[in-house]
C-alpha cells in the first residue's frame, strides 16, 4: 500500500482543515488508514482523523482544530496500521479556503432596487471577519447568456443593484462566495442559490 498523491490540505481558518490524497489502488480509507495530526506547540495533544473514501483510491479527512492562528503549524502522519506511509506538515494560514457565506436573501420591496444581503461566515473575533470580500453571481434561468458577476470589495455583506439592469418578468438566481486577500486565500464554495422573480415598472416612453 502506497500513497500515489500526497495529502494536500486547506483550512477554513476557524475550526476545520480538509486533507485529500490518493492511494495507489482501491482503498477502504476508514478501516485501513489513520491521519494523525498535532499542533507544534507546547502542551498540544495528538489527534486522530478517520478518513472517508473520496472515489476509489481517494481519501479525505476533516481535521478539527481549535483557535486557528497564523503561527500554527501541524505535523501530519499518515498510517496504515503500524506502517508510516507519509509524513508532512501543514500551516493552516498558508492554505486558506474561507467558509461559504450563508443566508443569501434578495429584498425586492425597495422601489426599483434589488438589495441582496448575506451573512459573514465568521464570528467577529476571527481575523477573517473583517477581511472578506465577495463575488455575487446573478443569472437568468431562462437565458444562459444572461450571467453576471458583481465584485463586492467593501466589508458590508450586501449588494444593491437597479432592478432595471435585469430583464423584467423573468426569474433570476443569485449566489455569493468569499475570499480574503490578506491570506491570499482561494475562493470559498458558492453559497446555496436563491431565486426571485424580477419585475419592475418600465419607464413610460413617449
Amino acid at each position: 500500500m502506497k500513497v500515489l498523491q500526497e495529502p494536500t490540505c486547506v483550512s477554513d481558518y476557524m475550526s476545520i482543515s480538509t486533507c485529500e490524497w490518493k492511494m495507489n489502488g482501491p482503498t477502504n480509507c476508514s478501516t485501513e488508514l489513520r491521519l494523525l495530526y498535532q499542533l507544534v506547540f507546547l502542551l498540544s495533544e495528538a489527534h486522530t482523523c478517520i478518513p472517508e473514501n473520496n472515489g476509489g483510491a481517494g481519501c479525505v479527512c476533516h481535521l478539527l482544530m481549535d483557535d486557528v492562528v497564523s503561527a500554527d503549524n501541524y505535523t501530519l502522519d499518515l498510517w496504515a496500521g503500524q506502517q508510516l506511509l507519509w509524513k508532512g506538515s501543514f500551516k493552516p494560514s498558508e492554505h486558506v479556503k474561507p467558509r461559504a457565506p450563508g443566508n443569501l436573501t434578495v429584498h425586492t420591496n425597495v422601489s426599483d432596487t434589488l438589495l441582496l444581503t448575506w451573512s459573514n461566515p465568521y464570528p467577529p473575533d476571527n481575523y477573517l471577519y473583517n477581511h472578506l470580500t465577495y463575488a455575487v453571481n446573478i443569472w437568468s434561468e431562462n437565458d444562459p447568456a444572461d450571467f453576471r458577476i458583481y465584485n463586492v470589495t467593501y466589508l458590508e455583506p450586501s449588494l444593491r443593484i437597479a432592478a432595471s439592469t435585469l430583464k423584467s418578468g423573468i426569474s433570476y438566481r443569485a449566489r455569493v462566495r468569499a475570499w480574503a486577500q490578506c491570506y491570499n486565500t482561494t475562493w470559498s464554495e458558492w453559497s446555496p442559490s436563491t431565486k426571485w422573480h424580477n419585475s419592475y415598472r418600465e419607464p413610460f416612453e413617449q
Partner: antibody
Framework: QVQLVQSGAEVKKPGASVKVSCKAS????????MHWARQAPGQGLEWMGI????????SYAQKFQGRVAMTRDTSTSTVYMELSSLRPEDTAVYYC?????????WGKGTLVTVSS | QSVLTQPPSVSAAPGQKVTISCSGG????????VSWYQQLPGTAPKLLIY???KRPSGVPDRFSGSKSGTSATLAITGLQTGDEADYYC????????????FGTGTKLTVL
Amino acid sequence: QVQLVQSGAEVKKPGASVKVSCKASGYAFTSYYMHWARQAPGQGLEWMGIINPRGGSTSYAQKFQGRVAMTRDTSTSTVYMELSSLRPEDTAVYYCARGKYWMYDWGKGTLVTVSS
Amino acid sequence: QSVLTQPPSVSAAPGQKVTISCSGGGSSIGNSYVSWYQQLPGTAPKLLIYDNNKRPSGVPDRFSGSKSGTSATLAITGLQTGDEADYYCGTWDTSPVWEWPFGTGTKLTVL
C-alpha cells in the same frame, strides 16, 4: 462575549499559599489555552505559566518551578493558580489571560498581598 | 527568561505620532510574532496588536505594528489623551524552553 472573572483580593503571611481562580465564559473553555501573569506594584508584566484546559497539562516559567501549580475544572470552566511558599516580593496583581501565542483576553486581576 | 527592551517613557502632543520600540536578543523576536498590549491606569492589559501587525476587532487603525529582524515597533498616530497608558510588547520563545517574555514597558504621556 468572553469574560474571565477572577477571585477577590487576598492577604497572606510569608510561607503561606494562595489559590487564585479564574472563571471563563463566552467561549469553548477547552478550546483555548490559559496563561497566568503577574505584575508587582509599579512594575512590568511577568509570565508565570500556561495550562491546556482540555487535558490539564501545564508548563511553568523556570522562576516559578516547584512553587506554582495550575489546574482546571472543566465542569465549572474555571482555572486555578496556586502559589506556595509566599514571600513579600510575591505581592502583585495576578492575571489569567486566554490565548496561545498571544493573550486575547485578560481577567481584571487579583491582588495578592504578602505581609507579616 | 528572555528580556525584551523598551524605552521607559515617550511623550507627544495630541494629534501627533509616536513610536515605541521593542528589541530582543536571541531567538525571541526574530523567530516569532510580536504582540502589543495597552494597560490604562488601574486596569488589566488589553491586546492591541498581534501577529506583528494585526489589530483585533475594535482597535482603531491609529495603532499599527511592524517588525524587522530582532526589533518591533508600535506606532500610534493622531494621539488622543485617552491613549495615555503603559504599553508592553510580548512574544514567545521556544529555546531552550518555551516562555512568553514581555517587554519592560513604556509609559506614554500625552502632553
